[in-house]
């Protein structure tokens, strides 16, 4: 429960948050557990601690390992733990079980696709989708806000979805993709 | 100091009503969920009822679903139990409790209690 | 709902000597257990959170330990004022539950 996995791609944008949640005004500190070392805060290093979240901007695979929080309130401390595992870019466009995320159903009536993680970033439209490596078009697919509608669902739109949408950090931007299956039922 | 503070406990026949009352000092009573022990004579302790900070959701122990409720005044900083339709077996000293932690969807542990309120419920 | 079992319901034991108090979940609930102590006449008092942490102000010999279903209360060298009721709490969901006691008393 206060383990997470969290995983990216090399020269992307990762950003995690500390699966040990606390209000808004609790302090955050994190570390990197093999070594203790404290996570900065400065916004001018690659990877640094921004109070629930730790951000890898852009990650490398080399920043994989485990990562602790400990949420401080004025009278108790709670730590959480976030197993980071950045991965090499594919050359192909097969993408890996272990770079997906959990499967969606839809049917005729109700076929959103989310995009998942998006809310941990800054990011502004427009959202970029992928079916199977192909960008989508036609008037079936609409982006909205955070997810995909598409319209008369068919058993033939099974298959992988991915989005892709920049995050802004200080005025620099960093690409991020995610990936997953989305799986048609009948009514 | 943090101090919590239960009233309007006492006698009351099976069927009757009561309502209980705690007040907060000490801390910012708003961002903090409130929760409802109690203690049969003798016995162990038993959760009844949690109420959220500023959002306000209720949560109850099947045993006084439908029959307590459970409620807040953030403007008096005082939290409520409205106990209706008693039974003997809701006689016990009943204790508010303070949660420190808990955000939206999860729980933690109780770090302040009161000294407590005795309902007896008899004829 | 989570059901917590506490043994033994009595621990007979004298000043100096080390405590182990056992509680046990029907199912997993990670660390979010607490511990409490209870003495005649009082409210409960907070020991020990997520399993393993003391709470503020709680002297050292207090400690807790355990993950899952299988959590223990150690009580290192037990002074004339740990002798109460000691209380485990599970919150890692609604209904918020509590063992049923084990009482420290003295030998």
């Known amino acids: 429960k206060f383990s997470k996995q969290s995983w990216g791609l090399e020269n992307e944008a990762l950003i995690v948050r500390c699966p040990r949640q606390g209000k808004p005004s609790y302090t955050v500190d994190w570390y990197y557990s093999q070594t203790n070392k404290s996570i900065p805060t400065q916004k001018r290093n690659r990877v640094f601690a921004s109070g629930q979240l730790l951000k890898f901007l852009p990650a490398a695979v080399a920043d994989s390992g485990i990562y602790t929080c400990i949420v401080r309130s004025p009278t108790f401390n709670r730590t959480g733990y976030a197993n980071v595992t950045i991965y090499k870019k594919q050359s192909d466009c097969n993408v890996p079980d272990y770079l997906m995320y959990s499967t969606v159903s839809g049917s005729e009536k109700n076929s959103k696709i989310y995009c998942p993680t998006i809310d941990l970033y800054n990011w502004t439209a427009p959202l970029e989708w992928f079916k199977n490596c192909q960008a989508l078009q036609g008037s079936r697919y609409r982006a909205h806000k955070s997810f995909l509608v598409i319209d008369n669902v068919m058993t033939e739109d099974a298959g992988d979805y991915t989005c892709k949408f920049i995050h802004n950090e200080n005025g620099a931007n960093y690409s991020v993709t995610a990936t997953r299956s989305f799986t048609v039922k009948d009514e | 100091e943090v101090q919590l503070l239960e009233s309007g406990g006492g006698l009351v026949q099976p069927g009757g009503s009561l309502r209980l009352s705690c007040a907060a000092s000490?801390?910012?009573?708003?961002?903090?969920?409130m929760i409802w022990v109690r203690q049969a004579p003798g016995k162990g302790l038993e959760w009844v009822s949690s109420i959220r900070g500023e959002g306000g959701g209720t949560y109850y122990a099947d045993s006084v679903k439908g029959r307590f409720t459970i409620s807040r005044d953030n403007s008096k900083n005082t939290l409520y139990l409205q106990m209706n339709s008693l039974r003997a077996e809701d006689t016990a000293v009943y204790y508010c409790?303070?949660?420190?932690?808990?955000?939206?969807?999860?729980?933690?542990?109780?770090?302040?209690w009161g000294q407590g309120t005795l309902v007896t419920v008899s004829s | 709902e989570i059901v917590l079992t506490q043994s033994p319901a009595t621990l007979s034991l004298s000043p100096g000597e080390r405590a182990t108090l056992s509680c046990r979940a029907s199912q997993s609930v990670d660390d979010d257990l607490a511990w409490y102590q209870q003495k005649p006449g009082q409210a409960p008092r907070l020991l020990i959170y997520?399993?393993?942490n003391r709470a503020t102000g709680i002297p050292a010999r207090f400690s807790g330990s355990g993950s899952g279903t299988d959590f223990t209360l150690t009580i290192s060298s037990l002074e004339p004022e740990d002798f109460a009721v000691y209380y485990c709490?599970?919150?890692?969901?609604?209904?918020?539950?509590f063992g049923q006691g084990t009482k420290v008393e003295i030998k």
């Open positions: 409790a303070r949660d420190p932690w808990s955000t939206e969807g999860s729980f933690f542990v109780l770090d302040y």
């Open positions: 709490q599970q919150y890692i969901t609604a209904p918020l539950t």
């Open positions: 000490g801390f910012t009573f708003s961002i903090y969920d």
């Open positions: 997520d399993a393993s």
